[in-house]
Interface confidence: low
């Protein structure tokens, strides 16, 4: 099967945009050449991460491929098209009034994208309206070179934002994860994601989610009551993609949020998370920037214990070992801590109930000039059975009104050398962070100083 072309391809014309956006009137996605479609998939999944500068880890500890390197490599493989779903863009330092050498990797990425357009490779970007980066001109710069850009008015459509962070390259390769198109994501923020190479079935499934954003980026777009059949997914928690990843039997599927952006066959992101938690029998390890069993962006906030209850039920009802590692930075909302302490209070080793919560504090060091950085921004979970890599923080709004995606992967142990499954690799990364000196137990946190490194 192949992804049919969606019904409409108009280009959003933002008012007073200084660069020439008119290039965007042609289709953002051209079907791949038949020959390319017929190539046999040889799927490969690589975990990628960003470690903030000046955050040394113990020698010999496990690590993933550096995100910046992976992104540049992925662009090097591009031959026809690159589709990017992104919350916002801020790849250059002066976007945020910062002159810091650590922004150079972001600038290299912008340079690479400009070169890509020079090679007549189609670049289509679906980005959020509202956006965080009002001063960034990355997208105008790329549009001047021929990029197609659409702003998806999630604020108007669902009262949320487009919070997804994924790429589809040539309808074959994928990046998805916690990192925004932001130079800080490459050098100043702790991130985790996955790159999947040579996997057209999964890539073209994720492309359908990109296309849901794309069609909502035309003027006066409205959410369809029912999404047309060509947006439907063939892969979900009941019927995941089955394939060999580097020779290892693997199942995988993409989930999405909010429900309004889940066409037929697409597993909802919250449902995917709950399913992974529900199937765990030994452990659930999660690393998230924020954990709130409430709404975050509605006033007054509502209590929303769905994920909290699932973790409690797993620990209390099945004896599953639960570990939650939460981001802690200068911009962390301190009202989160009572919820974390409440969850940890359930722990009772004598009754075989194991719930541990730590915060991960990235020392600011001499990087205090860089706002909204030096934090663990990851959004992943791993059990003995599955790996979940997402784009959503853990509170209600991210699943009910905000656009995000998740990837659920399960690999068969025993079919390869020990330690090679994706879930085992992710567990090792989690345990590296959990046992590092930057992971601090809640007992060690004094109120009012919650997220300042005391090292």
């Amino acid at each position: 099967w192949q992804v049919p072309r969606p019904p409409t391809w108009g280009q959003v014309q933002p008012k007073d945009v200084p660069r020439s956006w008119e290039h965007g009137s042609s289709p953002a996605w051209e079907p791949l050449e038949a020959e390319a479609r017929q190539q046999r998939d040889s799927c490969q999944l690589v975990l990628v991460e960003s470690i903030p500068q000046d955050l040394p880890s113990a020698a010999g500890s496990p690590s993933a491929q550096p995100l910046g390197q992976a992104w540049l490599q992925l662009l090097d493989t591009a031959q026809e098209s690159v589709h990017v779903a992104s919350y916002y863009w801020s790849l250059t330092g002066p976007d945020i009034g910062v002159n810091d050498s650590s922004s150079q990797l972001g600038e290299a990425l912008l340079q690479k994208l400009q070169q890509l357009l020079g090679r007549n490779i189609s670049l289509a970007v679906a980005t959020s309206s509202p956006t965080l980066a009002r001063t960034s001109t990355d997208l105008q710069v790329l549009a001047a070179r021929g990029a197609h850009v659409r702003q998806v008015p999630m604020g108007r459509l669902t009262r949320g934002v487009l919070h997804s962070k994924f790429w589809v390259v040539d309808g074959r390769h994928i990046y998805m994860g916690s990192a925004n198109m932001d130079w800080r994501s490459l050098t100043q923020v702790k991130e985790l994601g996955a790159v999947i190479y040579n996997c057209s079935h999964l890539a073209q499934d994720l492309e359908k989610t990109f296309q849901t954003y794309w069609v909502l980026g035309v003027p006066k777009a409205v959410l369809p009551k029912t999404w047309p059949q060509n947006f439907s997914s063939h892969f979900n928690r009941f019927q995941p993609f089955h394939g060999l990843f580097d020779g290892v039997p693997t199942t995988a599927y993409f989930s999405a949020s909010p429900p309004a952006l889940c066409p037929q066959g697409r597993t909802r992101d919250l449902e995917a998370l709950l399913a992974v938690m529900g199937s765990a029998q030994e452990f659930i390890y999660a690393s998230v920037m924020e954990y709130f069993p409430t709404t975050r962006f509605s006033h007054p906030p509502r209590y929303w214990p769905v994920l909290d209850n699932a973790l409690r039920a797993a620990a209390f009802g099945k004896g599953v070992r639960v570990r939650l590692l939460v981001g802690c930075g200068l911009n962390t909302d301190p009202t989160m801590f009572p919820y974390l302490r409440s969850l940890q209070a359930l722990s009772n080793p004598a009754a075989n109930v194991s719930v541990d919560v730590k915060v991960f504090i990235v020392p600011v060091g001499n990087h205090s000039n860089i706002p909204f950085s030096r934090v663990n921004h990851s959004k992943f979970m791993v059990t003995e059975k599955a790996a979940y890599i997402g784009t959503s923080n853990w509170s209600e709004d991210y699943f009910s009104s905000t656009a995000g995606v998740g990837l659920v992967v399960t690999q068969s142990p025993g079919a390869q050398p020990a330690g090679a499954t994706v879930q085992e690799q992710l567990r090792q990364l989690f345990e590296r962070d959990w046992s590092s000196r930057y992971a601090v137990g809640l007992d060690g946190q004094a109120p009012g100083q919650d997220c300042v490194w005391q090292g």
């Epitope: 200084p18 002066p94 912008l110 357009l117 090679r119 001109t137 105008q140 710069v141």
Partner: antibody, heavy 118, light 107 residues
Framework: QVQLQQPGAELVKPGTSVKMSCKAS????????MHWVKQRPGQGLEWIGD????????NYNEKFKSKATLTVDTSSSTAYMQLSSLTSEDSAVYYC???????????WGQGTSVTVSS | DIQMTQTTSSLSASLGDRVTISCRAS??????LNWYQQKPDGTVKLLIY???RLHSGVPSRFSGSGSGTDYSLTISNLEQEDIATYFC?????????FGGGTKLETK
């Protein structure tokens, strides 16, 4: 190191055309835009257009669209600009410059001085 | 097209002086402002890109600042080798455009 070599001068007759070269070395020629810039005697700089050697993709300043044609020969890492229907207004120094970080022109040739005279 | 204006076409200063050259764009160019130095022999060099980024090999006495429509190049301690003409250029909207230049001379 990055170098852009241009011939020093061209003397041409009105109504004819001239094709000037810019030989690049010290970097991957196909990965960077090549800009062309005009400077009339005692005047400022005017951007003519640019070309991406990896695909022959071009952008032109509207003012020079019917005057200049940009091409490349990737086998010799050389960029060319042809100016047609020459008049005295075309007498100027023409620079090639590599498009580097964020479209800044980071390395420049020495310039080719074109004199249009009968 | 975006017009770039360098109001001072020539400037006299003494060696060791702090010199500031300004440049104004006809509309917001979002920091996509580059500065070039042209020596009397015609040689052109990039000094500053993206408002404030020093190009490799450029002495640290050169610095750039600005935002929106107004930008400036500062030479903190003028040296003889800095005697040249300085051009600003916007890289925000095609076609790229240059200012008319500011010729720096010694008193």
């Amino acid at each position: 190191q990055v170098q852009l070599q241009q011939p020093g001068a061209e003397l041409v007759k009105p109504g004819t055309s001239v094709k000037m070269s810019c030989k690049a070395s010290g970097y991957t020629f196909t990965s960077y835009w090549m800009h062309w810039v005009k400077q009339r005697p005692g005047q400022g700089l005017e951007w003519i257009g640019d070309i991406y050697p990896g695909s022959d993709s071009t952008n032109y300043n509207e003012k020079f669209k019917s005057k200049a044609t940009l091409t490349v020969d990737t086998s010799s890492s050389t960029a060319y600009m042809q100016l047609s229907s020459l008049t005295s207004e075309d007498s100027a120094v023409y620079y090639c410059a590599r498009g580097g970080w964020l479209d800044a022109m980071d390395y420049w040739g020495q310039g080719t001085s074109v004199t249009v005279s009968s | 097209d975006i017009q770039m204006t360098q109001t001072t076409s020539s400037l006299s200063a003494s060696l060791g002086d702090r010199v500031t050259i300004s440049c104004r764009a006809s509309q917001d160019i979002s920091n996509y402002l580059n500065w070039y130095q042209q020596k009397p022999d015609g040689t052109v060099k990039l000094l500053i890109y993206y408002t404030s980024r020093l190009h490799s090999g450029v002495p640290s006495r050169f610095s750039g600042s600005g935002s929106g429509t107004d930008y400036s190049l500062t030479i903190s301690n003028l040296e003889q080798e800095d005697i040249a003409t300085y051009f600003c250029q916007q890289g925000n909207t095609l076609p790229w455009t240059f200012g008319g230049g500011t010729k720096l001379e010694t008193k």
